[in-house]
């Protein structure tokens, strides 16, 4: 390893040697901040090297060939600790016949543009000008690691210095830290930790809940295989090198569990046969929700207590429960599952469906003429209670009278009491078609199948009734 000893360029207090303190460079009248130099007169003897030389084609007035130009040797490898200051330089003596020369600094093949910590100083003599390009970093970081070179352009020729390799040493630096994980109880999993120097080697110790896991360190990178956990644990890794140790972030390893039940359920909307609910899922147990189950049972204490189950996807936390009875009370519970299992059911909530229009027509509709022949009597049976879908408020009767060239429809409303009605004969020698619908506050139900009766001309008497059969009596 080459020591960080500067190559003596000039006797006396000239700058240009390696400095690791923060004293400023000697400021001379010709010093300038990182800019091209204009050159004049005679040469200063140095120690040219054979690599990266340019043989200038220009000759003096006496046509004597000029010596090859090259940067002088300087320190090749500087090792220092993070946050320390460093200064290094390259120097060259250039015959004054060359004009407009520039020195630029490059790091790892990329030019360091606008670097405020580079300074170029010129020391003109009769025949040559000594140029010293200094580069200083006040507080080195790892990112300053690399190979630095000077480049000089003269007459389209490029002169390149030997590289100066800067090695910043410090505490280990993590390139891969363990990650938080959600794991299944008693199931093995791996954690990875990787750290780099310099200096190398870097050794890894693993820590679980503040206690070291491995007695002997492992060389970085290290993979820790945990055979399984029964409860949450915090893992970290320690990276050690000659400079000291660095501790990674602590990561929590959670044990997957069944989820918590939802924290809220909302009844968004109710209709006669459906209830729209939404819910806020509880804690997911460190495992994504897969689906949810809505359990519905009739709240009526006389019901048989059977539970309807509706399964749905976990998202969007919204479900329309369908196929419900109208004007009924229900208890609803929501449960969700992840890969481990189902949550408990949420507390049971109450919801009601609204009234709807009856879903079936009145049954067993019978129509006949009464003795006076001035009226038509209609009788029916109310729809089954379960299909009334609400509280019956009455019936709507449609009667259509048809005779040659005439058709006339009339609608009548009758109260809910009883199951008979009487309508006046509108036209003789005509057919009367009767249909009846049940009515609730939720609306008008379907009309019954038509029942027809012929109304004879005056003087005819036909008492035979017409009817629609009740279901099962056909």
């Amino acid at each position: 390893r080459e020591e960080a000893k500067p190559y003596p360029l000039f006797p006396g207090p000239f700058p240009g040697s390696l400095q690791t303190d923060h004293t400023p460079l000697l400021s001379l009248p010709h010093a300038s901040g990182y800019q091209p130099a204009l050159m004049f007169s005679p040469t200063q003897p140095g120690r040219p090297h054979t690599g990266n030389v340019a043989i200038p084609q220009v000759t003096s007035v006496e046509s004597k060939p000029l010596p090859p130009l090259a940067f002088k040797h300087t320190v090749g490898h500087i090792i220092l600790s993070e946050h320390k200051g460093v200064k290094f330089n390259c120097s060259i003596s250039v015959p004054n016949i060359y004009q407009d020369t520039t020195i630029s600094w490059w790091k790892d093949g990329k030019e360091l543009l606008g670097a405020h910590h580079a300074i170029t100083q010129f020391y003109p003599d009769d025949e040559v000008t000594a140029i010293i390009a200094s580069f200083s970093i006040t507080s080195v970081q790892r990112s300053d690691n690399g190979s630095y070179i000077c480049k000089m352009k003269i007459n389209n020729e490029e002169i390149v210095s030997d590289p100066i390799y800067i090695e910043v040493q410090g505490l280990p630096h993590f390139t891969k830290q363990p990650e938080s994980m959600n794991v299944t109880r008693n199931t093995a999993f791996n954690l990875t930790c990787q750290a780099v120097g310099p200096p190398e080697p870097v050794n890894i110790f693993w820590v679980q809940n503040s206690s070291r896991v491995n007695e002997q360190p492992e060389k970085s990178p290290s993979v820790l295989t945990v055979p399984g956990l029964t409860e949450m644990a915090v893992f970290s890794c320690e990276a050690h090198n000659d400079k000291g140790l660095t501790v990674s972030k602590g990561v929590q390893i959670n044990i997957k569990a069944i989820p918590s039940p939802p924290t809220e359920v909302s009844i968004r909307n109710s209709t006669a046969h459906s209830i729209l609910i939404s819910w806020v899922p509880g804690f997911d147990g460190y495992s994504p929700f897969r689906n949810c189950s809505i359990q519905v049972k009739e709240a009526d204490p006389l019901s048989n207590g059977s539970v309807m189950i509706f399964n749905t996807s976990a998202l969007p936390h919204l479900y329309q429960i369908k196929q419900l009875q109208a004007l009924a009370n229900y208890s609803i519970g929501v449960s969700c599952m992840n890969e481990i299992g189902w949550s408990a059911v949420s507390p049971w909530i109450l919801a009601s469906t609204t009234e709807g229009a009856p879903s079936v027509a009145p049954l067993n509709v019978t129509v006949f003429l009464n003795e006076s022949s001035d009226n038509v009597d209609i009788r029916w049976m109310k729809p089954p209670t379960k299909q009334q879908d609400g509280e019956l408020v009455g019936y709507r009767i449609s009667h259509v009278w048809q005779s040659a060239g005439i058709s006339k429809e009339l609608l009548e409303e009758v109260g809910q009491n009883g199951s008979r009605a009487r309508i006046s004969v509108q036209v003789h020698n005509a057919t009367c078609t009767v249909r009846i619908a049940a009515v609730t506050r939720g609306g008008v139900g379907p009309f019954s199948d038509p029942v027809k009766i012929f109304i004879p001309a005056h003087g005819w008497v036909d008492y035979a009734p017409s009817s629609t059969p009740a279901p099962g009596n056909a």
Partner: antibody
Amino acid sequence: EQQLVESGGGLIQPGGSLRLSCAVSGFSLSSNAMSWVRQAPGKGLEWVGIISSSGSTYSASWAKGRFTISKDSSKNTMYLQMNSLRAEDTAVYFCARVGFFVGYGAYDYGIIHRLDLWGQGTLVTVSS
Amino acid sequence: DAQLTQSPSTLSASVGDRVTITCQSSKSIYNNNWLSWYQQKPGKPPKLLIYDASDLASGVPSRFSGSGSGTEFTLTISSLQPDDFATYYCAGGYSGDSDYAFGGGTKVEIK
């Protein structure tokens, strides 16, 4: 660790305003309804109001118009804005997490099932 | 507004005693069972003991139990321990109303 911390209490003159805060840690306000409950010195508990996870608020009938509950989910903090304060509002004000809540959106009310986590409380003294 | 009435308001008992506190509601509690019991010690916030009238909250000792439905509820401590001297509150909600009602409290003190 799941925790609730109230702040903002103090001495205030009658007619004045005060805003209490409830800082939540260990769980999210976007997943839980929250409630305020108060307790006058030497007296029992009195419910003030609730804010659901979606931000709907419901207040005790006596608090409507003077007390407003709000929250900032990004800060995981709930607030109680108290205006036109009176001497009888002197109490320790607790924030509490609602373990389960049912909302009846169509009818604009909701029901608390239980309050399963409480803060230590902050004392509000209304006095001239 | 619905009201919850606790009795007694104060109860003197000794360690090891069986203690019963009742809570009566002026109308049926939501779902007949959405009633909770809370324990509060001086200078401390309340702590949930029982919910759904009879379900023990997490970490609550089994000597505490609850029962009842509709409008009548009971909290029982089967064998009073020194740590149980405190004030107990019942609370519940009602259909059609957002108000969460608390009972007046029962102070259990050392005899």
